[in-house]
């Protein structure tokens, strides 16, 4: 059975939407199949608002009878897109989302594209290639990622609040230095999560604190100077670099695609 290591190819297209294509990592296949290729399933995180291309197994059209894409989205009936080579016809059943289409004519390219990916595209996508000697499958558990909006502000004396708003999945928030922290999560109906971490530093030699937000779409770090003024409320939004305001400078660092290197801190 093939090893499920992945290759994620990302490119920029003219319409300024990133496009990613996920197929088998050739270097990791150790393919020893008999008649039927065992079901191969891949979990694939993909950013919202990008374009995604999903691939079938590498089988030449001349060997095929039918190509079917089966799409199972949450709360919807299963959608199938099928191409029968013999009659050169395509058929769709229960497919209402016009953003999910064949990349081109299925007799030229069996890949499926989502242009652009929306939060509702979370689900399971499977290519089934029917040959005279059995079926070959390639399945994708598509996980749509939403980048959270990050804010950091001081709301009381020596207390700071870091929020990662409407991310998917939930972001991880950690602090440097560690303080006395409480973290809350708020779940939204569209599947996004807001994480709010409130920290207090009793030690007076701590003057600057950093909030580090880890997320599959990238990591963000903001720092703030703790003001001694009682009741001071300082805030700034994440997303830029070197934001300044009247009271203090905040450094914001954005690290793309570092989802595989998160540090998980649990605060009480």
């Amino acid at each position: 059975q093939p090893n499920n290591s992945l290759m994620l190819q990302t490119s920029k297209e003219n319409h300024a939407l990133a496009s990613s294509s996920l197929c088998m990592d050739e270097k990791q296949i150790t393919q020893n199949y008999s008649k039927v290729l065992a079901e191969v399933n891949t979990s694939w995180p993909v950013k919202m608002a990008t374009n995604a291309v999903l691939c079938c197994p590498p089988i030449a059209l001349r060997n095929l009878i039918i190509i079917t894409w089966e799409i199972i989205l949450r709360g919807q009936p299963s959608c199938t897109k099928a191409y029968r080579k013999e009659t050169n016809e395509t058929k769709e059943t229960n497919c209402t989302d016009e953003r999910i289409t064949w990349v081109s004519r299925p007799d030229q390219n069996s890949d499926l594209q989502i242009r652009p990916v929306a939060i509702t595209h979370d689900g399971y996508y499977r290519c089934i290639m029917v040959t005279p000697d059995g079926n070959f499958h390639r399945g994708y558990h598509l996980q749509v990622l939403v980048t959270p909006e990050v804010t950091l502000f001081q709301n009381r004396n020596r207390t700071a609040v870091c929020k990662a708003v409407a991310g998917k999945p939930a972001a991880q928030i950690s602090w440097i230095p560690e303080g006395d922290c409480a973290t809350k999560q708020e779940y939204w109906s569209n599947g996004t999560v807001t994480v709010k971490s409130t920290c207090h530093w009793e030690v007076h030699n701590v003057s600057t604190v950093t909030c580090h937000v880890s997320h599959l779409t990238g990591n963000k770090s903001l720092y703030i100077e703790l003001l001694p003024v009682p009741g001071a409320k300082k805030s700034a939004k994440g997303g830029g670099s070197g934001l300044n305001d009247i009271f203090e400078a905040q450094k914001i660092e954005w690290h793309e695609g570092s989802g595989g290197h998160h540090h998980h801190h649990h605060h009480h």
Epitope: M7, Q31, S110, D133
Partner: antibody, heavy 119, light 110 residues
Framework: EVQLVQSGAEVKKPGASVKVSCKAS????????MFWVRQAPGQRLEWIGY????????KYNEKFKGRATLTSDKSASTAYMELSSLRSEDTAVYYC????????????WGQGTLVTVSS | DIQLTQSPSSLSASVGDRVTITCRAS??????????MHWYQQKPGKPPKLLIY???NLESGVPSRFSGSGSGTDFTLTISSLQPEDFATYYC????????FGGGTKVEIK
């Protein structure tokens, strides 16, 4: 065990035709596309065409169109390659090869049939 | 049609040597995340034997000293430590829509 057994060597005169057979065993003959490839002495391997016994689809290398004919006998699990209007440069070893689905690769080959064209 | 150019056309090597053969395609043979490039070994009077498929996958039963790499237009076959039975001719081959072979690389004893 998958096996492809080809017919024996042939000697032909220029202008004649030759028909090479490839008998398949160890698998369902109609399930796999059969390719024909030739190799002239000291030359690279050269594709002639393929036949899909499942639906009798054929495709030929432009170079051999009109001269090569690929057929199959499903009941005998045998593929045939006929080449007409032979010339001396057709002297080569002719191979049949079964295309495996995954990656369109050739794991199984016939042993080869030497066709000599000489006056 | 895609043309495949192999280099070198021949090479002399000794047992234990590391051998590298390259194959360049006239246009990309990679599509949908797969590179349709295979490598075969052929000995005199025998049909070709599949070594590597889809650029980098070792065919079952082939010794691990053989490896393949590359994508797009440039591909490499490497024999990490040449053995006496490896002296043969090696071909790259592309087979997506049309089938083409490289010109071959003959590996001879030095």
């Amino acid at each position: 065990e998958v096996q492809l057994v080809q017919s024996g060597a042939e000697v032909k005169k220029p202008g004649a035709s030759v028909k090479v057979s490839c008998k398949a065993s160890g698998y369902t003959f109609t399930s796999y596309v059969m390719f024909w490839v030739r190799q002239a002495p000291g030359q690279r391997l050269e594709w002639i065409g393929y036949i899909n016994p499942y639906n009798d689809d054929t495709k030929y290398n432009e170079k051999f169109k009109g001269r090569a004919t690929l057929t199959s006998d499903k009941s005998a699990s045998t593929a045939y390659m006929e080449l007409s209007s032979l010339r001396s440069e057709d002297t080569a070893v002719y191979y049949c090869a079964r295309e495996d689905y995954y990656g369109s690769r050739f794991v199984y080959w016939g042993q080869g049939t030497l066709v000599t064209v000489s006056s | 049609d895609i043309q495949l150019t192999q280099s070198p056309s021949s090479l002399s090597a000794s047992v234990g040597d590391r051998v590298t053969i390259t194959c360049r395609a006239s246009k990309s043979v990679s599509t949908s995340g797969y590179s349709y490039m295979h490598w075969y070994q052929q000995k005199p009077g025998k049909p070709p034997k599949l070594l590597i498929y889809l650029a980098s996958n070792l065919e079952s039963g082939v010794p691990s000293r053989f490896s393949g790499s590359g994508s797009g237009t440039d591909f490499t076959l490497t024999i990490s430590s040449l053995q006496p039975e490896d002296f043969a001719t090696y071909y790259c081959q592309h087979n997506r829509e049309l089938l083409t072979f490289g010109g071959g690389t003959k590996v001879e004893i030095k």
